[in-house]
Interface confidence: low
């Protein structure tokens, strides 16, 4: 018979054969042959691999690091990574918790409407017209657009709720 | 390595005076942001005060704003907090926190604490 160019799910192809892969939790050993079924060992303490896969060597479990304010959530298994979140009162960096914050900082755009306390996060509110932040902070208010009338001085570009306005000299040239 | 260590915590009756000190080695303090923290029993960490590496701005928590004082000394690598008019609420653990700045605190590193009991 013809041999294979494609291998049906939780299979792969290797030297003109579909081989199984190995499931979620294992690693591995050798592939297949004619005679023989792959062949796939557990995954050590402390380590995990989530998918069907041909995979020689299984990952490390994620280490949450106490030093940035991290603990474990969820424990790792065999088919899972260990899920890291923050000490209470602390927020995580990004989607994947690598680090800690002890409070969220609103965006450019937005200011802090409330400071987090010890069991709430920062609160954050769009700047209004009039208003603007340039930075991230977890603790800086909207600040309102310079007024350029009091200094004698006229709008030579407008605000926006991330920028200032610009002000600049008054046009002498009048008919 | 960073280290921190606090000292000068104790019981003190409401109304009374404490002053915390922080010691830190292991790291360039003068350019280090720092801020204490604190720790209620049962509660979360708490905000109390932060003074930056630029100039030594400080920021302080609105529940001890008027009564406590942040400082620091970068020729003793050392930071202060000048606790007064203390309340049974202000009773906690207090912890000596570097950041990466004083706009995005971030954990960091902190030390074990310094227990502050206000009891009549």
């Known amino acids: 018979p013809e041999p294979p160019t494609a291998c049906r799910e939780k299979q792969y192809l290797i030297n003109s054969q579909c081989c199984s892969l190995c499931q979620p939790g294992q690693k591995l050993v050798s592939d297949c042959t004619e005679f023989t079924e792959t062949e796939c060992l557990p995954c050590g303490e402390s380590e995990f691999l989530d998918t069907w896969n041909r995979e020689t060597h299984c990952h490390q479990h994620k280490y949450c690091d106490p030093n940035l304010g991290l603990r474990v959530q969820q424990k790792g298994t065999s088919e899972t990574d260990t899920i890291c979140t923050c000490e209470e009162g602390w927020h995580c960096t990004s989607e994947a918790c690598e680090s800690c914050v002890l409070h969220r900082s609103c965006s450019p755009g937005f200011g802090v409407k409330q400071i987090a306390t010890g069991v709430s996060d920062t609160i954050c509110e769009p700047c209004p017209v009039g208003f603007f932040s340039n930075v991230s902070s977890a603790f800086e208010k909207c600040h309102p657009w310079t007024s350029c009338e009091t200094k004698d001085l006229v709008v030579q570009q407008a605000g926006t709720n991330k920028t200032d306005v610009v002000c600049g000299p008054q046009d002498r040239l009048r008919a | 390595e960073v280290q921190l260590v606090e000292s000068g915590g104790g019981v003190v009756q409401p109304g009374g005076s404490l002053r915390l000190s922080c010691a830190a080695s292991g790291f360039t303090f003068s350019s280090a942001t720092m801020g204490w923290f604190r720790q209620a029993p049962g509660k979360g960490l708490e905000w109390v005060a932060y003074i930056s590496s630029v100039g030594g701005g400080t920021d302080y928590a609105d529940s001890v704003k008027g009564r406590f004082t942040i400082s620091r000394d970068n020729a003793k690598n050392t930071l202060y907090l000048q606790m007064n008019s203390l309340r049974a609420e202000d009773t906690a653990v207090y912890y000596c926190?570097?950041?990466?700045?004083?706009?995005?605190?971030?954990?960091?590193?902190r030390g074990q604490g310094t227990l502050v009991t206000v009891s009549s």
């Open positions: 926190v570097t950041m990466r700045s004083i706009r995005n605190p971030d954990f960091g590193s």
